[in-house]
């Protein structure tokens, strides 16, 4: 039961990360103009990784998209790329980690299989994660470079030269919501492998043992003991009998709604 | 059409208040701010402060804020404007806007002509 | 607070003739983020309100007539009247729409022969 607990949550706290990371990605409030003393502004400047915009205190906002890949700061096209990959893969490993996952039943797939499944996902997500943090504390740190640089006639976010001292850009929300949510990918990715290593057949000292209820012999047959690599052996005490019976993981064997076939 | 009515004039006592009024129709009131702006005789034009109807929020100039109290009515559509213990030097004509496109004030309404005199 | 300083602050011309006066503001107007100035032009007529001829420095109000023109960005503004007309009689007014307080120039009043 806690295999698929830890699965099910694995993929789960997986699918929040993500569409957390698309999120921020399509959110317009990457930087946001640093207000410092002046809380109430007429002009409020903010800026994402595909356009930036404007916002009056009329309450007009225009919004102008970046329409050249040529002429932007190559952080920020690191960035993109950063944030794309982190999406892609996480894409990938919801995919597979769906078929994966303990509680859907497709065919008749080993848990072998699932295994391996489920620790390809959790690896996905987890370089997802990793892509997503990364991203998001590149763009952070262009930040707080570029903070402090606010003198006359300097490069101003994505405009030009300005005669006035530039508008000073500091961390918008989604950068936190970038980094909360490349976390909650990581954290699911590692629950993922976590969950892997429970689904893995459990090699034991006894690889099988025969049951003859009219004979008098008992056939013992001893297999080798494995040392554990740590995703191979099952911690779980999996019944080394067929006689029905299932674990509690294994319960749910009829086709249901949730099942994929 | 788009219009702002107020008062034509008011006559007040030094040292007294007056609330100034101003009714807003032909647009959604609490969608826009609405703006104040102070003209004395035969001289420029000060703003004084801006109010959103729909929130309530409101900016004003530091010169104004011990002077001027921006607040809305949104049942009625209508802006007020209190000026409190009145001088001489409050004798103007205070003018309610609409700011659009561009922060400008695309609306204005007729004004209201305060005279403070004994 | 931005200063906004207008010049002439009067002049005297003949109907058709063509006039150009300006406002220097004590900052830049231009906002980086959308490559706009946020300077505005009011036109003033006696006994009225005033009335937005030009918003965004250049960007002229629906209703104004063409002959109104709006230029200049960062701190230098021009508003021109290519033809000059009787009801053009008025004071001018510049604003400052950048930042808190909004502020008005002293205004330009034109006066006609």
């Known amino acids: 039961m806690a295999v698929t607990a830890c699965q099910g949550l694995g993929f789960v706290v997986s699918l929040i990360g993500i569409a957390g990371i698309i999120a921020a990605t399509c959110m317009d409030q990457w930087s946001t103009q640093d207000l410092y003393n002046n809380p109430v502004t007429a002009v409020f400047n903010y800026q994402g990784l595909w356009r930036s915009c404007v916002r009056e205190s009329s309450g007009f906002t225009e919004c102008r998209g970046y329409f050249t890949l040529l002429g932007l700061p190559a952080m920020l096209q690191a960035v993109r790329a950063l944030m794309i990959v982190g999406i892609v893969l996480g894409a990938i490993g919801l995919l597979v980690s769906i078929f994966a996952l303990k509680c859907i039943r497709i065919g008749s797939m080993e848990d072998s299989a699932k295994a391996n499944m489920t620790l390809t996902s959790g690896i996905m997500f987890i370089v997802s994660g990793l892509c997503a943090i990364a991203g998001v504390s590149v763009f952070a740190n262009m930040l707080v470079t570029n903070f402090w640089m606010s003198t006359a006639n300097m490069y101003t976010g994505m405009g030009g030269m300005v005669q006035t001292v530039q508008t000073r850009y500091t961390f918008g929300a989604a950068l936190f919501v970038g980094w909360v949510a490349g976390g909650l990918t990581l954290i699911g990715g590692v629950m993922m492998c976590i969950a892997c290593r429970g689904l893995a057949p459990e090699e034991t000292n006894y690889k099988a043992v025969s049951y003859h209820a009219s004979g008098h012999s008992v056939a013992y047959k001893p297999g080798g003991f494995k040392a554990s690599t740590g995703f191979g052996s099952n911690t779980k005490n999996k019944k080394i009998y067929d006689g029905g019976a299932r674990t509690e993981d294994e319960v749910q064997s009829y086709p249901s709604k949730h099942d994929y076939v | 059409q788009v219009q702002l009515q107020q008062p034509g004039a008011e006559l007040v006592k030094p040292g007294t208040s007056v609330k100034l009024s101003c009714k807003a129709s032909g647009y959604t009131f609490t969608s826009y701010w609405t703006h104040w702006v102070k003209q004395r005789p035969g001289q420029g034009l000060e703003w004084i402060g801006m109010i959103h109807p729909n929130s309530g929020s409101s900016n004003y100039n530091e010169k104004f804020k011990s002077k001027a109290t921006l607040t809305v009515d949104k049942s009625s559509s209508t802006a007020y404007m209190q000026l409190r213990r009145l001088t001489s030097e409050d004798s103007a004509v205070y003018y309610c806007?609409?700011?659009?496109?561009?922060?400008?004030?695309?609306?204005w309404g007729q004004g209201t002509s305060v005279t403070v005199s004994s | 607070d931005i200063v906004m300083t207008q010049s002439p602050s009067s002049l005297t011309v003949t109907a058709g003739e063509k006039v150009t006066m300006t406002c220097k503001s004590s900052?830049?107007?231009?906002?980086?983020?959308?490559?706009?100035?946020?300077l505005t032009w009011y036109q003033q007529k006696p006994g009225q309100p005033p009335k937005l001829l030009i918003y965004?420095?250049?960007t002229r109000e629906s209703g104004v007539p063409d002959r109104f023109t709006g230029s200049g960005s960062g701190t230098d503004f021009t508003l021109t009247i290519s033809s000059v007309q009787a009801e053009d009689l008025a004071i001018y007014y510049c604003?400052?729409?950048?930042?808190?307080?909004?502020?008005f120039g002293s205004g330009t009043k034109l006066e006609i022969k």
């Open positions: 900052q830049s107007l231009l906002n980086s983020g959308n490559q706009k100035n946020y």
């Open positions: 806007t609409r700011i659009h496109y561009g922060n400008a004030m695309d609306y």
């Open positions: 604003q400052n729409d950048y930042s808190f307080p909004f502020t």
């Open positions: 965004w420095a250049s």
